[in-house]
Interface confidence: medium
């Protein structure tokens, strides 16, 4: 049924999503405070501008009785039916901010008829891509996979000399969230991973893992994980591990890495760690001062979502434009604007574009260090460390195929 | 040791220029998005402008969008900001940093505009 949108007369209001089945486990308090905190700035900002108007959110809270799994595994009926909540109660706002889950977001965005932008912190998954009024305000896989793409076809830096064809993807099935939809992108058929790679063969037992690190017929000497070192260290602990395999952790939500008394496991002499550059701490946060690295990515990814909504407005009422229109619902990409704690980027359809770093640990100092930084925006590597102290032979990337020389 | 030094702030008339700089030591400068921060008296910071590690992608708080241009030399490990057609609500002190938590920002060189 058609909703009314309480979206005019100088009130504009934000229909927030509190699922109890999440991408991480958050607890809602916390996120009530960084939509608190955004909606702070936002009225600063319009009234900074001269505009005289109402921006609040209202929280829509799942009953819980039915989903209650707290991850992601039963979200999709808890998104509509927190939907189902809103027709009911004829009250939507201009602009909606949830859900997390990609499962929720791909079954709200396939059941109703959007005619509101959709704000999402989370919704890694390839079918959530390329949806015309859903915005993702965290790294979904898509941009990983270009970045993988990218490198493995990278073969003109000093410390990467070979074009990789190759890869074994190590995916158990217990994965968070992000993992999970990243893993799942690299493992799809028809990706553009699958679809760029000679070879790619996904390991699903530990075992298979443990072996491979030592098979001398192993068909690729790559392997892309995601989780963080202590994950690694439970699958892999202190096993030999063959001179020239090299291991892709993917990790980038977590700041520990830039951390300054951090000395890397020697466990993770073979592994290089992609994650993002880590938000500006030069803006003290009080939303975020107690939580994880991980967590401040998904509580301020709700900040962000408020501060975007916030900069769209600002557009359409500066420009005498309605809001309640398709031309609103559609207009949250292609566009940069002032996030918490610096700019963000939205590509053409609306996923944020970010700076991966790519980081290697120091066989002198055993400390992480950055070997590349990779932007999202314009699929470009830059590298950084052109001598890096490598634990590979003659500090060069190996070959991903054993025994195969300069391509 | 890990060090930023902002150089180049000062006193300026209204509608005057003045360019800052931000030697930057102690790490791999290029690896980085770098930004500039400011903070007026009594005031919370505010992020002015950044710019990408490879230098090709720049960014302006609206404020600021137009008269001022961010720029870096990873050559020289320095973060550079042209400031033009200033104004007083331009007053604070200027600070640059990283993107990365462990590299705290400078000292901050204080830029003041007034007639």
């Known amino acids: 049924s058609q909703v009314s949108q309480n979206c005019h007369n100088g009130s504009y209001e934000i229909s927030v999503l509190m699922m109890g089945n999440s991408a991480f486990a958050e607890p809602l308090k916390n996120l009530e405070d960084a939509v608190n905190e955004g909606l702070e700035i936002v009225r600063g900002r319009l009234q900074n501008a001269g505009l005289n108007v109402t921006v609040n959110a209202t929280f829509m809270y799942s009953d819980g009785l039915i989903h209650n799994s707290g991850d992601c595994r039963s979200s999709t009926c808890e998104g509509l039916d927190l939907l189902r909540k809103i027709s009911n109660a004829q009250r939507m706002g201009c602009v909606l901010i949830g859900p997390s889950c990609t499962y929720s977001t791909f079954q709200m965005y396939l059941d109703t008829e959007l005619s509101y932008p959709m704000i999402s912190a989370g919704s890694f998954g390839l079918s959530c891509d390329y949806k015309e009024t859903l915005t993702r305000l965290m790294s979904p896989a898509r941009k990983l996979m270009y970045f993988l793409v990218n490198f493995w076809k990278t073969n003109d830096l000093p410390f990467k000399t070979y074009s990789w064809s190759t890869s074994y993807v190590y995916k158990n099935g217990t994965e968070t969230e992000d993992c999970f939809w990243y893993l799942n992108a690299l493992e799809a058929s028809v990706s553009y991973f699958s679809h760029e790679l000679g070879f790619k063969v996904v390991l699903r037992q530990d075992k298979e893992f443990q072996d491979i690190l030592m098979d001398h017929n192993r068909k690729s000497n790559v392997i892309i994980m995601c989780g963080g070192p202590e994950f690694l260290y439970k699958l892999k602990g202190d096993r030999a591990v063959a001179e020239d395999i090299v291991i892709i952790l993917v990790d980038l939500f977590n700041d520990q890495y830039f951390e300054d008394n951090v000395t890397a496991p020697d466990y993770m002499k073979n592994v290089l760690v992609l994650t993002l550059s880590p938000g500006n701490s030069l803006l003290n946060s009080s939303f975020s001062r107690n939580l994880s690295p991980t967590k401040r990515d998904f509580a301020l990814a709700y900040l962000n979502g408020i501060l975007l909504f916030g900069h769209m407005l600002k557009i359409f009422l500066e420009n005498g434009e309605n809001i309640t229109t398709p031309k609103f619902a559609h207009a949250f990409r292609n566009l940069t604007f002032e996030g918490y704690d610096g700019p963000v980027t939205l590509d053409d359809w609306g996923d944020v574009d970010s700076t991966m770093v790519l980081l290697y640990t120091s066989v002198d100092t055993k400390k992480y260090k950055v070997l590349l930084t990779y932007d999202t925006h314009v699929n470009k590597t830059y590298p950084v460390d052109m001598s890096p102290t490598f634990t590979w032979k003659n500090s060069k990337l190996p070959n991903d195929i054993t025994g195969r020389g300069p391509q | 040791a890990v060090q930023l030094v902002e150089s180049g702030g000062g006193m300026v008339q209204p509608g005057g220029s003045l360019r800052l700089s931000c030697a930057a030591s102690?790490?791999?400068?290029?690896?980085?998005?770098m930004t500039w921060v400011r903070q007026a008296p009594g005031k919370g910071a505010e992020w002015v402008s950044a710019?990408?590690?490879?230098?090709?992608?720049?960014y302006y708080t609206d404020s600021v969008k137009g008269r001022f241009t961010i720029s870096r030399d990873n050559a020289k490990n320095t973060l550079y900001l042209q400031m033009n057609s200033l104004k007083p609500a331009d007053t604070a002190k200027y600070y640059c940093?990283?993107?990365?938590?462990?590299?705290?920002r400078g000292q901050g060189t204080q830029v003041t505009v007034s007639s």
């Open positions: 102690g790490f791999t400068f290029g690896a980085y998005d």
């Open positions: 940093g990283t993107k990365i938590p462990q590299f705290l």
């Open positions: 710019i990408n590690s490879g230098g090709d992608r720049t």
